[in-house]
């Protein structure tokens, strides 16, 4: 069964920034993976970036940099500054799309107990979601 | 089958404003960026910025912040960009696109001109 | 920003001749994670807004015909027309799809010899 991981770290450097990692653990074919904030895409929360891996990355505000880590797995670092900054118990989830699968979505947030530059372990933690 | 439709010609004086429409449809509205283009006569291509219309989050190119503004409303699946203080040098072809730049508007005409 | 430089400006080639147009990118195009190059070819005729031909240098959108073909990694690319016809006279870009802002080559205007 495909699953997807979501690790989030505070960076120890600037304690308002964090990374987000994401994975997909399956077979298929990547067609395209979102990252939001706040909860699930579309069931109130805001999409931070959107990577195709091969059309682009597109990305928005407080993110910086979104990339493929991998054929598999993205990073996404988040600058924390003003009203749009990231705290400490924001949720993050990604989506991914794929086939033949279809689409599998999964969230994390920072343990309560994180030191800054500590990772929270990678979460697997799918939803099935048929909506291709 | 996506579409993009936009607004029809504009003629404006300079120093004016001029708001040019993208309705869409044929796809989730929300879900991808709306792409804003231009291309002055016999000129190349020139990315303005995008809106990603589910957040209403945007991203301008530099040349243009402060005159620009795009917008969306989600509810009529249409996007809107707006540029301020015209001057002679944005008569253009103005274009909107999604999904990479995969689909495109048919394009408005903006004639700046006193 | 990244500068996309195309050449020739123009070029003209006879009806079921080959056609070869070149671009290259100030910074690399290429995402080393996933070793996919970030640069698109689109077409453009009279009258008419850009039609995306290739994306990831070399992927086709789908309905282009199989006589466009793209090629190249890092900063350089080329856009292939293996078999010139008449409806191919247009002007075509090069377009970083890497890294903001999206930027746009100057140009190719191919014609028929």
């Known amino acids: 069964t495909p699953e997807v991981w979501v690790q989030v770290r505070m960076e120890a450097t600037e304690l308002s920034s964090f990374t987000i990692r994401c994975g997909f653990l399956g077979s298929g074919s990547i067609s395209l993976v979102t990252v939001s904030w706040g909860g699930p895409n579309g069931a109130g929360g805001t999409t931070l970036a959107v990577l195709h891996p091969e059309r682009g990355i597109r990305q928005w505000a407080p993110a910086r940099q979104a990339r493929w880590e991998t054929q598999s797995s993205i990073s996404l670092i988040l600058e924390g500054s003003g009203a749009s900054s990231p705290c400490a118990n924001t949720t993050f989830c990604c989506k991914f799309a794929s086939f033949p699968e279809g689409s599998w979505e999964a969230c994390g947030s920072l343990p309560p107990s994180s030191d800054p530059g500590l990772s929270a372990p990678p979460t697997p933690a799918p939803i099935l979601r048929a909506d291709l | 089958e996506v579409q993009l439709v936009q607004s029809g010609a504009e003629v404006k004086k300079p120093g004016s404003s001029v708001k040019v429409s993208c309705k869409a449809s044929?796809?989730?509205?929300?879900?991808?960026?709306i792409e804003w283009v231009r291309q002055a006569p016999g000129q190349g291509l020139e990315w303005m910025g995008e809106i990603l219309p589910g957040s209403n989050s945007t991203n301008y190119n530099e040349k243009f912040k402060g005159r620009v503004t795009i917008t969306a409303d989600e509810s009529t699946s249409t996007a809107y960009m707006e540029l301020s203080s015209l001057r002679s040098e944005d008569t253009a072809v103005y274009y909107c696109?999604?999904?990479?730049?995969?689909?495109w508007g048919q394009g408005t005409l903006v004639t700046v001109s006193s | 920003d990244i500068v996309m430089t195309q050449s020739p400006d123009s070029l003209a080639v006879s009806l079921g001749e080959r056609a070869t147009i070149n671009c290259k990118s100030s910074q690399s195009l290429l995402n080393s994670g996933n070793q996919k190059n970030y640069l698109a070819w689109y077409q453009q005729k009279p009258g008419q807004p850009p039609k995306l031909l290739i994306y990831?240098?070399?992927t086709r959108e789908s309905g282009v015909p199989d006589r466009f073909s793209g090629s190249g990694s890092g900063t350089d690319f080329t856009l292939t027309i293996s078999s010139l016809q008449a409806e191919d006279v247009a002007v075509y870009y090069c377009?970083?799809?890497?890294?903001?802002?999206?930027?746009f080559g100057q140009g190719t205007k191919l014609e028929i010899k």
């Open positions: 696109s999604s999904y990479w730049f995969a689909y």
């Open positions: 377009q970083n799809a890497h890294s903001y802002p999206p930027t």
């Open positions: 990831g240098a070399s």
């Open positions: 044929g796809y989730t509205f929300s879900s991808f960026s």
